[in-house]
């Protein structure tokens, strides 16, 4: 995301358009307290950060509310008066969805359909994974509004399932984030469970001739 | 499949006005910011104006500032740009973008404006 | 407002050769970099976005590499269909800025 000038490499994450973090890694100004500068519009003023993330005693970020802006972030990184990164770019194209909200599981015979509230901006993937303790890894399925129909499921088999929210990055370019995880649930013949046993029995091998 | 059609240009006499559109389609349109670029003919590319996704806010290359508006209506996936006291200058092909911040992916056909003076 | 140098502005090459083209930032802009090819009466055609990441669909003979200051956009192996203007993008600051232009034509 942040090359470096003058050796400060930049991260931002947009929350889901509510809080924008900016946070900067620095070697060659690793003592020092940089300066996060910034404005919405480019007439105005630079603001100074007052919400500054610190590592090891000295800044390293700054969190700003920026509630629903989907317009430019102009700032400036400086050391006292020197810039030392200094760029304008739209914040929704660091967007990091929440985690998906009120995930439901309808069950009817093998197949489960996962739902969950959608949110309010468009061009998302909402992704379930699962697995069963005989598999080795995640299955996985995404669809672009959150209900997503999983079939082929033995009923008789314990699934573990979790669900993310993603970006299209067709749309919003390489510089996204997926959602946290949502908590992972188990169910088994259509019903929660607390846990999937981690461990299965192992099949039996099969007697060579 | 993310599309971008404008129309709309066409032959204007100097100190006319001019609005021609850009009809978007195969993403969320209100999600994003859109862009207006120009090429003289024979010339290299120019951005002209930017807006965000709501509309709220608006860019504007100096050279059209107070001239030319850029503007939305989210409800018909349509992206405008308005232009006022036209010079010889401003003939050109204009051409809607939509990208993000590392690169422009989409872009319109083009449509060419032609100022007599 | 970043100013983009390209060079060469004109390129006589023929098919089968290697071409670079060079971008130049009055300052630094991270990675923050796109190439474009544009064809006459065509609009132009993303190929490189963060300065060295290929857009899908783009030949793997186009690459692109640099950081800061400077950029670069090699083809590795020419083919007819790569004759056509080349120009870089600034997307670290607004406004953004585009190079002047390189024009790849046949020796």
């Known amino acids: 995301q942040g090359g470096a000038a003058e050796g400060v490499q930049i991260q931002i994450i947009y929350f889901n358009l509510e809080t924008v973090q900016v946070t900067w890694n620095a070697s060659k100004y690793s003592r020092t307290n940089l300066t996060f500068h910034y404005r919405f519009n480019g007439d105005e003023a630079y603001d100074q950060c007052t919400n500054y993330l610190l590592q090891e005693g000295h800044t390293s970020g700054c969190l700003l509310d920026a509630e629903q802006r989907d317009d430019i972030l102009y700032f400036s990184i400086r050391n006292g008066t020197h810039p030392v990164f200094t760029a304008s770019r739209w914040m929704v194209y660091y967007l990091k969805p929440s985690s998906p909200k009120h995930v439901r599981f309808s069950w009817h015979q093998d197949a489960v359909t996962v739902t969950c509230s959608d949110l309010s901006y468009g061009d998302l993937l909402y992704e379930v994974q699962y697995r069963s303790p005989f598999d080795t890894e995640w299955q996985s399925k995404q669809e672009n509004t959150c209900n997503v129909t999983i079939e082929g499921l033995d009923a008789e088999k314990c699934y573990s399932f979790w669900v993310r929210v993603k970006a299209m990055e067709d749309v919003y370019g390489p510089d996204t984030y997926p959602s946290d995880w949502s908590e992972v649930t188990c169910w088994q013949r259509g019903e929660i469970r607390d846990a999937c046993a981690e461990t299965p029995t192992p099949p039996k091998p099969k007697l060579s001739k | 499949e993310v599309q971008l059609v404008e129309s709309g240009g066409g032959l204007v006499q100097s100190g006319g006005s001019l609005r021609f559109s850009c009809a978007a389609s195969g993403f969320t349109f209100s999600s994003h910011p859109m862009n207006w670029v120009r090429q003289v003919p024979g010339k290299g590319l120019e951005w002209v104006s930017s807006?965000?996704?709501?509309?709220?806010?608006?860019y504007y290359a100096d050279f059209v500032k107070g001239r030319f508006t850029i503007s939305r209506d989210n409800s018909k996936n349509t992206l405008y740009l308005q232009m006022n006291s036209l010079r010889a200058e401003d003939t050109a092909v204009y051409y809607c973008a939509k990208g993000h911040n590392s690169g422009w992916k989409y872009w319109g056909q083009g449509t060419l404006v032609t100022v007599s003076s | 407002d970043i100013q983009l140098t390209q060079s060469p502005s004109f390129l006589s090459a023929s098919v089968g050769d290697r071409v670079t083209i060079t971008c130049r930032a009055s300052q630094g802009i991270s990675s923050y970099l796109a190439w474009y090819q544009q064809k006459p009466g065509k609009a132009p055609k993303l190929l490189i976005y963060a300065a060295s990441t290929l857009q899908s669909g783009v030949p793997s003979r186009f690459s692109g590499s640099g950081s800061g200051t400077e950029f670069t956009l090699t083809i590795s192996s020419l083919q007819p269909e790569d004759f056509a203007t080349y120009y870089c993008?600034?997307?670290?600051?607004?406004?953004?800025?585009f190079g002047q232009g390189t024009k790849v034509d046949i020796k």
């Open positions: 993008q600034q997307l670290n600051s607004y406004p953004p800025t």
């Open positions: 807006i965000s996704g709501s509309g709220g806010s608006t």
